[in-house]
């Protein structure tokens, strides 16, 4: 028969034949042959693989470093990574929670809706049209664009959610 050019789901093509992938929680030891099945082995303690795979090494579980204020929220298994969170009163800097801060800052384009308290983190909101924030801040609200008209000037450059408008002199009509 013709050698396959594509394989079914949960299989992979090697040496012109389709082999079964290893299930989550297991790593590849040897590819299948004409006569043998794919050989897989369970991941060791503190290791995991979360997909059907042909990896020869399992991934190490994430380490929740207490020196960074991290602790284990959910212990990893052979099929899932460890999930870290921050100590009480601290907040993750990102979805991955790789370090902890007392309170998060709002990025440029966002302003502080509510300053952090002992129990809740900073609440950010996008700067609406007519307002901007050009800094990363845990305290500053969005600022209103400068009103060029009140200074007897005209808008030379439009504002954005991250930048103020640029005002300039009105064009004088030449005689």
């Amino acid at each position: 028969p013709e050698p396959p050019t594509a394989c079914r789901e949960k299989q992979y093509l090697i040496n012109s034949q389709c082999c079964s992938l290893c299930q989550p929680g297991q790593k590849l030891v040897s590819d299948c042959t004409e006569f043998t099945e794919t050989e897989c082995l369970p991941c060791g303690e503190s290791e995991f693989l979360d997909t059907w795979n042909r990896e020869t090494h399992c991934h190490q579980h994430k380490y929740c470093d207490p020196n960074l204020g991290l602790r284990v929220q959910q212990k990893g298994t052979s099929e899932t990574d460890t999930i870290c969170t921050c100590e009480e009163g601290w907040h993750c800097t990102s979805e991955a929670c790789e370090s902890c801060v007392l309170h998060r800052s709002c990025s440029p384009g966002f302003g502080v809706k509510q300053i952090a308290t002992g129990v809740s983190d900073t609440i950010c909101e996008p700067c609406p049209v007519g307002f901007f924030s050009n800094v990363s801040s845990a305290f500053e609200k969005c600022h209103p664009w400068t009103s060029c008209e009140t200074k007897d000037l005209v808008v030379q450059q439009a504002g954005t959610n991250k930048t103020d408008v640029v005002c300039g002199p009105q064009d004088r009509l030449r005689a």
Epitope: N67, L68, W90, S99, C100, V101, L102, V135, S137, F139
Partner: nanobody, 116 residues
Framework: EVQLLASGGGLVQPGGSLRLSCAAS????????MIWVRQAPGKGLEWISA????????YYADSVKGRFTISRDNSKNTLYLQMNSLRAEDTAVYYC?????????WGQGTLVTVSS
Amino acid sequence: EVQLLASGGGLVQPGGSLRLSCAASGFTFEEEEMIWVRQAPGKGLEWISAISGSGGSTYYADSVKGRFTISRDNSKNTLYLQMNSLRAEDTAVYYCGKEPFRFDYWGQGTLVTVSS
């Protein structure tokens, strides 16, 4: 390397005043929002005051509003906290920091004890 060194703490009677200073180095001071936090004995960290890079905007926790004043001198890379009408509950180690205030770096604090 970021270095933040708070000083000016001490023993003061209730109703008294103290001025804390924070010497900063290792970063562009005037570009950073700076804060004061404190840790009372057996308690967690409490944010008490913050100031924008320019010094134009200041922020205070309700617990110190009207009594404490934050300021900065960007030419000296120094942050200040003027504390008036001190109370026993203000007793704590005070730390200065730059935003965002990271768990892995608090700098050196200064102890303020309010007692008669």
